[in-house]
């Protein structure tokens, strides 16, 4: 469940709202696990996907755009 | 269109059992998470339990071993076994789905199914 | 755990604005959702992500959120707004809703 685009295929439950004990640092997660929504603070942390939160590593991670790769989905997929 | 229809409420006796459904059309069903909250009458609205589309499962601590939520993705349909049912369990209980990841708002509810336990 | 706290009831005159409040420790930092019920139907999602509307809301209705309140508003306020209104958030693992707020247009 890499790059793909918005949809809701990769369900999983709320982790909480952590606030600051977040860690700030992630790569796109490629194992299966739970994910819920990111806590607010990552409101802008996708730039061109959607955000989502791991539980079990409490680190944002990102389901980017169609033609968008990267952790943060921040550069253009030059093969899409 | 999109709807969820609640079923298997009732009257049962304090420590019985009962298990509710949820039917689910319109979207796919397996793609989102799912919750219960219920309503005690002239009572605001209280989340139960919720699943997520791979299974993980969170209860709210009054129901912590005695209910359980469960799917059944090929029929789309979700559950509530409510089991050692006590008379403050008394509610409207509305099944709602969760846009998205959990965590989001529940853009879709049911129209909910009252729960009525008393001897 | 986390509480959300609502006014019992807010009273508004037809056509008025109103106003309905819910307080949380620090809830500026969490999304916060406002669903409307009537009575005998299932609740109604009018506000999410603090001030967005989903389709079919009127652009009456709006929202705030920031430091530790955030605020439902109902503005030229019809006789069919009348009804409880719920906030909600999320919080460890849970769901948290308010204790509702019954609105009567006057």
């Known amino acids: 469940d890499g790059n793909s685009t918005r949809s809701p295929e990769t369900n999983g439950l709320l982790c909480g709202d952590p606030e600051e004990n977040c860690a700030a640092t992630t790569t796109q997660s490629k194992r299966k696990g739970h994910f819920s929504r990111c806590p607010k603070q990552y409101k802008h942390y996708c730039i061109k996907g959607r955000c989502r939160f791991v539980v079990a590593e409490q680190t944002p991670s990102c389901v980017c755009d169609e033609g968008y790769i990267g952790a943060r989905c921040e550069r253009v997929d030059l093969f899409y | 269109q999109v709807q969820l229809l609640e079923s298997g409420g009732g009257l049962v006796q304090p420590g019985g059992s009962l298990r509710l459904s949820c039917a689910a059309s319109?979207?796919?069903?397996?793609?989102?998470?799912m919750s219960w909250v219920r309503q005690a009458p002239g009572k605001g609205l209280e989340w139960v339990s919720g699943?997520?589309?791979?299974?993980?499962?969170t209860y709210t601590d009054s129901v912590k071993g005695r209910f359980t939520i469960s799917r059944d993705n090929s029929k789309n349909t979700l559950y509530l076994q409510m089991n050692s049912l006590r008379a403050e369990d008394t509610a409207v209980y509305y099944c709602?789905?969760?846009?998205?990841?959990?965590?989001?708002?529940?853009?879709?509810w049911g129209q909910g199914t009252l729960v009525t336990v008393s001897s | 755990s986390y509480e959300l706290t609502q006014p019992l009831s807010v009273s508004v005159a037809l056509g008025q604005t109103a106003r309905i409040t819910c307080s949380g420790d620090?809830?500026?930092?969490?999304?916060v959702h406002w669903y409307q019920q009537k009575p005998g139907q299932a609740p109604v999602l009018v506000i999410y992500?603090?001030?967005d509307r989903p389709s079919g809301i009127p652009e009456r209705f709006s929202g705030s959120n920031s430091g530790n309140t955030a605020t439902l508003t109902i503005s030229r306020a019809q006789a069919g707004d009348e009804a409880d209104y719920y906030c909600?958030?999320?919080?460890?693992?849970?769901?948290?809703f308010g204790g509702g707020t019954k609105l009567t247009v006057l």
């Open positions: 992500d603090d001030s």
């Open positions: 909600q958030a999320w919080d460890m693992q849970s769901v948290v």
């Open positions: 699943l997520g589309h791979v299974g993980y499962t």
């Open positions: 620090k809830i500026g930092k969490k999304y």
């Open positions: 709602a789905r969760d846009y998205l990841d959990f965590g989001y708002y529940f853009d879709v």
């Open positions: 319109g979207f796919t069903f397996s793609s989102y998470a």
